[in-house]
């Protein structure tokens, strides 16, 4: 493909001096948002060039010299970002008495062979030809850094261009990053992040917990020392050049922290209205155990789910859990402290406490003299109990007489699917107190208000019952 | 932290054989262990827990045919009287939580959650 | 004793695909969730992906999906992938009894 001479054949500008028409040396695609390469010369301006040149011999005519053979000077600097496609030239004339002239490419002193996109194009006139090769790398990559030169061999010798330095720019790359620890909690530590360039400087943002650290950059490469910490965070630094940032992985400071949750709980007895427990303390998280909470809730679908938490020290691992109702089934589960914080609470276990005495007295007590059999007649409802104890197994009734000078107690017990009971008249002419109480296998509970009835003397009756009210009459 | 079986080989009917699991990175006083075998081609069959406190339950089946005991760092299971059956990898295996009943004399297993990689023992004659 | 019972076995699905596997107790489990799942690979120890029917263990992948209460539990796995081919065990233990029973095993077979 033949291409517009993008330059003069002969020598134009001084050599070592940036001209304009040296950019169009460098074709690079204009996409959105690109910026030009830079480049610049290997010389300084003014001086005066004494690269490698070949004197060619007199001509046939033997009266005139032919100049100097040289590559002229091109862009010596090209900058560019990774991924970018480049293309950069050398250019020569070369007096048409030569034949047979090739170009070829050396990167930092090896010869490019093989599949490179190495074009050379031929512009002949009358008395030179231009020679122009091109050199093109598609999506540069760091690796593609370096200085290249043409080379040209003309009756054995050697011409060497200026060297083109291509410098791949792209975003940092860490040589360093920070690594996960473990430290003590408030202990001072040191985090290392480098990463380096092209394009140099490159500054170091750190980053704790997703937030900046240091509001100013530091260069890299930056050591942060955390003066301590109180819980775990993530680290990571950022590394800023003019290409744009890298963010470096996160790592995880792990620090002594809040327990782990007992490995073990153990129920050792029960009773109606406690549980002794023990437990095994997990992992400390390095920081000794201050104190413990077991945590108590009932398991019944008509409990409001409240939980009730007891607070014990640390040592001994063992509590009594009190305040319990009886013939109950709780979920426990066990926590521990220490400096930092509570631990996740156990695994919730299950325990009953035992059965226990009924807490409540039976209802509507009714008591009244049967004259004829000589007795008294008692009457109650079952005990209204929100919980019941234990199994119901009877009823005891305490019957009190008394009259002048005399009191004496008798007890009496009945069957649990009794709701009466007579008791034979004890004394005439004294007053009768009845008191009735229900028994679980628990034990008995509390008796109700005393009912008082008087016993005549034989041949008086009077069939007026006495009674407890019932609840909220009275 | 980690866990590894040890001791299992060929042996003949009836000679007892001791397999052993050493921890690390964690305390036997702190956690509650237990073994488990796997017969050749079969599923998991649990063999027995040792609680941090050294108290010992086993699965009814194994009750009698097996012993489990503990140092401050290993474990041990000794095969009584082994059987051409009792061919199996025995796997030890950390307990994450244990429940213990004293009063009744039993416990239940939360967790297995650190495995060994077992230990094959051949019975044979 | 109690006995968990395991279906189906074998089980398979697509890469991507989803798979469910039940798990049935005789009895209701200790407190109706102590029980756990285990996945074994050929050649390897098992190894814990859910306890308290539904809570992952650490490291588990969210398309490991446990639930269920008392006596019924279930394991899905949803997106499928080939790592997933393994035999799947559930496990759990009751009140009033120290045994520790396992399922049968079910194996998943990732196509």
């Known amino acids: 493909r033949e291409e517009a001479k993008p330059y003069p054949l002969f020598p134009g500008p001084l050599p070592g001096s940036l001209q304009t028409d040296h950019t169009s040396l460098l074709s690079l695609p204009h996409t959105s948002g690109y910026q030009p390469a830079l480049m610049f010369s290997p010389t300084q301006p003014g001086r005066p060039y004494t690269g490698n040149v070949a004197i060619p011999r007199v001509t046939s005519a033997g009266s005139k010299l032919l100049p100097p053979l040289a590559f002229k000077h091109t862009v010596g600097h090209i900058i560019l970002s990774e991924h970018k496609d480049v293309k950069f030239n050398c250019s020569i004339s070369v007096p048409n008495i030569y034949q047979d002239t090739t170009i070829s490419w050396w990167k930092d002193g090896k010869e490019l062979l093989g599949a490179h996109h190495a074009i050379t194009q031929f512009y002949p006139d009358d008395e030179v030809t231009a020679i122009i090769a091109s050199f093109s790398i598609t999506s540069v990559q760091r690796s593609d850094n370096g200085s290249y030169i043409c080379k040209m061999k003309i009756n054995n010798e050697e011409i060497v261009s200026d060297p083109i330095y291509i410098e791949v720019q792209g975003l940092p790359h860490f040589t360093k990053q920070p690594e996960s620890m473990n430290v003590t909690r408030n202990t001072a530590f040191n985090l290392t992040c480098q990463a380096v360039g092209p394009p140099e400087p490159v500054n170091i943002f750190w980053v704790q917990n997703s937030s900046r650290v240091n509001e100013q950059p530091e260069k890299s490469p930056s050591v942060l020392t955390v003066p301590g910490l109180t819980e775990m965070a993530v680290f990571s630094c950022e590394a800023h050049n003019d290409k744009g940032l890298t963010v470096s992985k996160g790592v995880q400071i792990n620090i002594k922290a809040i327990p782990s949750p007992p490995t073990e709980v153990s129920i050792h007895n029960s009773t109606a209205h406690s549980i002794l427990i023990s437990w095994v303390p997990g992992f400390d998280g390095y920081s000794p155990f201050r104190n413990c909470s077991v945590q108590v809730k009932e398991v019944d679908p008509l409990s409001n789910g409240s939980v009730m938490i007891f607070n014990t020290s640390a040592s001994p691992h063992m509590y009594q859990i009190k305040q319990l109702q009886a013939l109950a089934n709780y979920s426990i589960g066990v926590s521990c402290m220490n400096e930092i914080g509570w631990s996740a609470v156990s695994p919730w276990i299950l325990a009953s406490t035992t059965e226990g005495a009924p807490s409540v007295a039976p209802l509507n007590v009714t008591v009244f003299l049967n004259e004829s059999r000589d007795n008294v007649d008692i009457r109650w409802m079952k005990p209204l109990t929100k919980r019941q104890a234990g199994e119901l197994v009877g009823y005891r009734i305490s019957h009190v007489w008394q009259s002048a000078g005399i009191s004496k107690e008798l007890l009496e017990e009945v069957g649990q699917n009794n709701s009466r009971a007579q008791i034979s008249v004890q004394v005439h002419n004294a007053t009768c107190t009845v008191r009735i109480a229900a028994v679980t296998k628990g034990g008995v509970g509390p008796f109700s208000d005393p009912v008082k009835i008087f016993i005549p003397a034989h041949g008086w009756v009077d069939h007026a019952p006495s009674s407890t009210p019932a609840p909220g009459n009275a | 932290q980690s866990v590894e079986e040890s001791g299992g080989r060929l042996v003949t009917p009836g000679t007892p054989l001791t397999l052993t699991c050493t921890v690390s990175?964690?305390?036997?006083?702190?956690?509650?262990m237990s073994w488990v075998r796997q017969a050749p081609g079969k599923g998991l069959e649990w063999i027995g827990i040792?609680?941090?406190?050294?108290s010992t339950y086993s699965a009814s089946w194994a009750k009698g045919r097996f012993t489990i005991s503990k140092t401050s760092t290993t474990m041990d299971l000794k095969i009584t009287s082994p059987t051409t059956e009792d061919t199996a990898t025995y796997f030890c295996a950390r307990v994450g939580f244990f429940v213990g009943y004293g009063a009744y004399d039993y416990g239940i297993i939360h967790r297995l959650d650190l495995w060994g990689q077992g230990t094959l023992v051949t019975v044979s004659s | 004793a109690a006995v968990l019972t395991q279906t189906p076995s074998p089980v398979s699905a697509a890469v991507g695909g989803t798979v469910s596997i039940s798990c049935q107790s005789s009895k209701s489990i200790y407190n109706n969730n102590w029980l756990s799942w285990y996945q074994q690979k050929p050649g390897q120890p098992p190894k814990l992906l859910i306890y308290d029917a539904s809570d992952l263990a650490s490291g588990v992948p969210s398309r490991f999906e446990g639930s269920g209460s008392g006596t019924e539990f279930t394991l899905t796995i949803s997106d499928l992938e080939c790592d997933d081919a393994a035999t799947y065990y559930c496990?759990?233990?009751?009140?009033?009894?120290?045994?520790?029973?396992f399922g049968g095993g079910t194996e998943v077979v990732v196509k």
């Open positions: 990175g964690f305390s036997l006083s702190s956690n509650a």
């Open positions: 040792i609680s941090s406190s050294g």
């Open positions: 496990a759990g233990g009751y009140s009033g009894d120290s045994d520790y029973a």
